[in-house]
Interface confidence: medium
């Protein structure tokens, strides 16, 4: 074979967002018949020559960027895309509220606001069932996520996390769930308001295939991202390369 071997995939199961003291498994997947895997934590000297790393209890020190590669004969593969393992529950949960309220008429506007304390200048807003979070571009201790022209599809359970751009892999606990109810529509919402919100441990299904991809710079546009946009779109003039999250392999 000419050229380097194709890169493997690296996944965190059940999620790359891991509550402190909870288990997570990092799995490197290459083609059949691999001679040797190497899984490493970047910016550290930690590595192991195995395809699977089981972490029985997540610690702050284990949060960070990981990648893997494999060897066949004397050839090494290209490295996998980086997987960024985030420890959650490190800091107090932010508060999540809806303005003017959590019940909104179809076609109306609502703003979800996540608020925390000084020094936590980054936010991620998750809607259960969506494959990626929404990011607020502006660094501040509260973040606004406007939803313009609400539809039934916006109904559901939302949570937000806060973290510091100084320690981007150490996140807060999730906010209490906020149930957004869209009235005046016959379409079934994605989650019934009477149904109890799922516990944090089960919430990971929405993020099971996320690879967190941070940069040191936040989006420079001051306009908050409307969460009617597709999660795969970039709201940055620099394009998708500066998105914070990309779908895992």
């Amino acid at each position: 074979q000419s050229g380097p071997l194709p890169k493997p995939s690296l996944q965190a199961l059940p999620s790359s967002l891991v509550p402190l003291e909870k288990p997570v498994t990092l799995r490197c997947q290459g083609p059949p018949g691999v001679d040797l895997y190497r899984l490493e934590k970047l910016s550290s000297s930690r590595y192991q020559d195995q395809a699977v790393l089981f972490i029985p209890a997540m610690k702050r020190s284990l949060a960070g960027r990981y990648r893997c590669s494999y060897q066949n004969g004397s050839l090494w593969s290209l490295p996998s895309d980086q997987l960024e393992l985030v420890a959650t529950g490190v800091f107090a949960k932010p508060s999540l509220s809806a303005q003017p309220g959590p019940a909104v008429s179809s076609g109306g506007d609502v703003t979800l606001q996540c608020q925390t304390r000084y020094g936590f200048d980054q936010f991620a807003l998750y809607k259960e069932g969506d494959p990626a979070p929404y990011k607020n571009p502006e660094r501040w201790y509260r973040a606004s996520f406007p939803i313009i022209t609400v539809t039934a599809a916006h109904s559901g359970t939302y949570r937000c996390y806060s973290f510091s751009s100084r320690d981007p892999y150490l996140w807060s606990a999730p906010s209490d769930p906020l149930e957004l109810v869209v009235t005046g529509t016959s379409v079934t919402p994605s989650r019934l308001p009477t149904e109890p919100p799922s516990p944090v441990a089960e919430f990971s299904e929405a993020t099971a295939e996320l690879t967190v991809s941070f940069t040191n710079e936040v989006f420079t546009t001051e306009t908050s991202r409307s969460i009617t946009a597709s999660p795969k779109e970039s709201d940055s003039p620099a394009g998708p390369a500066r998105q914070y999250y990309t779908k895992g392999n």
Epitope: F91, A92, G119, E138, N216, V218, T220, E222
Partner: antibody, heavy 115, light 111 residues
Framework: VMLVESGGGLVKPGGSLKLSCAAS????????MSWVRQTPEKRLEWVAT????????YYPDSVKGRFTISRDNAKNTLYLQMSSLRSADTAMYYC?????????WGQGTTLTVSS | DIVLTQSPASLAVSLGQRATISCRAS??????????MHWYQQKPGQPPKLLFY???NLESGIPARFSGSGSRTDFTLTINPVETDDVATYYC?????????FGGGTKLEIK
């Protein structure tokens, strides 16, 4: 990282003044910024904060309604407009990059309020 | 407002010895087990310089002779061993509660 303050001077009580802070060496538009002052007695006091894009501002009660923080990200410049100045506002004024704590500070510019 | 009281106000230490500076908060600055207390060094004619953030996280480029510890209301900055270059005033600052406040400073001198 470099932060360079300017605009300080001698002002009479009740007067106004605008301070500037020119930033370089980092992506200015990505960071919340603050003004912190140091009195002649060497006490430090946080004065104002503005979010990275300029949408949000925050002040302690001691300057609220009298001071206005703003920024021009195209010019990489932070401002502090001060009015209704009092002798208690006499201080060295520093601009600083803000994480809740302040990881980079300018050299400061001096404001003296005196009749 | 949270009041931060530093002690002593001034401190004279022999070269090579240990310097210990205390900062006491009028109420807890902890949240979720994290202490929102920070330390700065200010040399004459210079702006403050960040030493530690969140009580014990050493800022990049600061020598390991400096250590930060404490939780809730009681925090300590330790320099061991003290060197000539450490002559400065040291300040603590909290960011757990608005408004953010600073301690009154501790002036370190060489004996």
């Amino acid at each position: 990282v470099m932060l360079v303050e300017s605009g300080g001077g001698l002002v009479k009580p009740g007067g106004s003044l605008k301070l500037s802070c020119a930033a370089s060496g980092f992506t200015f538009s990505s960071y919340a910024m603050s003004w912190v002052r140091q009195t002649p007695e060497k006490r430090l006091e946080w004065v104002a904060t503005i979010s990275s894009g300029g949408s949000y501002t925050y002040y302690p009660d001691s300057v609220k309604g009298r001071f206005t923080i703003s920024r021009d990200n195209a010019k990489n410049t932070l401002y502090l407009q001060m009015s209704s100045l009092r002798s208690a506002d006499t201080a060295m004024y520093y601009c600083a990059r803000d994480y809740g704590y302040f990881d980079y500070w300018g050299q400061g510019t001096t404001l003296t309020v005196s009749s | 407002d949270i009041v931060l009281t530093q002690s002593p106000a001034s401190l004279a230490v022999s070269l090579g010895q240990r310097a210990t500076i205390s900062c006491r908060a009028s109420e807890s600055v902890d949240n979720y087990g994290i202490s929102f207390m920070h330390w700065y060094q200010q040399k004459p004619g210079q702006p403050p310089k960040l030493l530690f953030y969140r009580a014990s996280n050493l800022e990049s480029g600061i020598p390991a002779r400096f250590s930060g510890s404490g939780s809730r209301t009681d925090f300590t900055l330790t320099i061991n061993p003290v060197e000539t270059d450490d002559v400065a005033t040291y300040y603590c600052q909290q960011s757990n509660t608005d408004p953010r406040t600073f301690g009154g400073g501790t002036k370190l001198e060489i004996k």
